[in-house]
């Protein structure tokens, strides 16, 4: 067997694959959750039909020190065309409701599964 690791950069992930990988990571989080996710941290609820990826990142990026969602934060940063920093709320037009991270993840997962089923990979 030949090991090619490190020699060739992997090709860009097609949108459908990228979306599936994000769904798989969110499934992972919900299934492996034992204690309250991120110690029960609260984040802004988002409108899942309006510029969802950047808005989701803007909400979740304000949770620090929670290893369980670090991969999700990283993945979402690749799903947003502009750079998002903690405390930035450009895509989060309405900030009126806070929910627990666990609920946020569940809501996002349900919506992404629906998009995937409908073939909306954009």
């Amino acid at each position: 067997l030949t090991c090619l690791g490190g020699f060739a950069s992997p090709g860009p992930v097609p949108p459908s694959t990228a979306l599936r990988e994000l769904i798989e990571e969110l499934v992972n989080i919900t299934q492996n959750q034992k204690a309250p996710l991120c110690n029960g941290s609260m984040v802004w609820s988002i409108n899942l039909t309006a510029g969802m990826y950047c808005a989701a990142l803007e909400s979740l990026i304000n949770v620090s020190g929670c290893s369980a969602i670090e991969k999700t934060q990283r993945m979402l940063s690749g799903f947003c065309p502009h750079k998002v920093s903690a405390g930035q709320f450009s895509s989060l037009h309405v900030r009126d409701t806070k929910i627990e991270v666990a609920q946020f993840v569940k809501d996002l997962l349900l919506h992404l599964k629906k998009l995937f089923r409908e073939g909306q990979f954009n």
């Epitope: 039909t49 510029g51 969802m52 750079k83 909306q120």
Partner: antibody
Framework: EVQLVQSGAEVLKPGATVLISCKVS????????MHWVQQAPGKGLEWMGR????????KYAPKFHDRVTITADTSTDTAYMELSSLRSEDTAVYYC???????????WGQGTLVTVSS | QAVVTQEPSLTVSPGGTVTLTCRSS?????????ANWVQEKPGQLFRGLIG???NRAPGVPARFSGSLLGDKAALTLSGAQPEDEAEYFC?????????FGTGTKVTVL
């Protein structure tokens, strides 16, 4: 004043590699993604990829992913785009452009003409 | 890979209104495509006009507005000025990469 200043025109042979620089001023380099765009003669625009100068994380367009490398040097506030295995159809003007939510593609370099000819 | 198409050319009278559209081959354009509009004038730097579907870039006149129109992204120019004569490109975000549209040449006549 925000400025993006690119390196000069290049004439190269097929198979060669070109490295274009984009030196920025007037803002904090690491605060924004830098994108690169190609415009071939008489053609439209093609997005090539982008970099987060803070950590070097990149995204590339499917068309270019195996030949393009985007890097950033935070010590000089300069982004670089390297395109390898050049062919005649890579003859184009290449642009760096800053992108953010409030200023989408708001600032552009002056462009660098790359001519690939044997 | 998606293809993003625009009207090749449109003509508008000075003071008139024109709407440019941007269609995706993969289906309806949504807010998660973060539609962008860029202006190109000969001999000048490109200029970003609109991002995130409807956010005007700083310094862009209010006569330029972005929206979703049916299943497409749209750029509406209300009260066209002679200096608005240019090529306009849209760009749509597909989860992890942009694809630019074919471009629309707008003539103010």
């Amino acid at each position: 004043e925000v400025q993006l200043v690119q390196s000069g025109a290049e004439v190269l042979k097929p198979g060669a590699t070109v490295l274009i620089s984009c030196k920025v001023s007037g803002y904090t380099f690491t605060d924004y993604y830098m994108h690169w765009v190609q415009q071939a003669p008489g053609k439209g625009l093609e997005w090539m990829g982008r970099i987060d100068p803070e950590d070097g994380e990149t995204k590339y367009a499917p068309k270019f992913h195996d030949r393009v490398t985007i890097t950033a040097d935070t010590s000089t506030d300069t982004a670089y785009m390297e395109l390898s295995s050049l062919r005649s159809e890579d003859t184009a003007v290449y642009y760096c452009t800053r992108y953010d939510y409030y200023g989408p593609f708001a600032y552009w370099g002056q462009g660098t003409l790359v001519t690939v000819s044997s | 890979q998606a293809v993003v198409t625009q009207e090749p050319s449109l003509t508008v009278s000075p003071g008139g209104t024109v709407t440019l559209t941007c269609r995706s081959s993969t289906g309806a354009v949504t807010t998660s495509n973060y539609a962008n509009w860029v202006q190109e004038k000969p001999g000048q730097l490109f200029r970003g006009l609109i991002g995130g579907t409807n956010n005007r870039a700083p310094g862009v006149p209010a006569r330029f507005s972005g929206s979703l129109l049916g299943d497409k992204a749209a750029l509406t120019l209300s009260g066209a000025q002679p200096e608005d004569e240019a090529e306009y490109f849209c760009a749509l975000w597909y989860i992890n990469h942009f694809i630019f549209g074919t471009g629309t040449k707008v003539t103010v006549l």
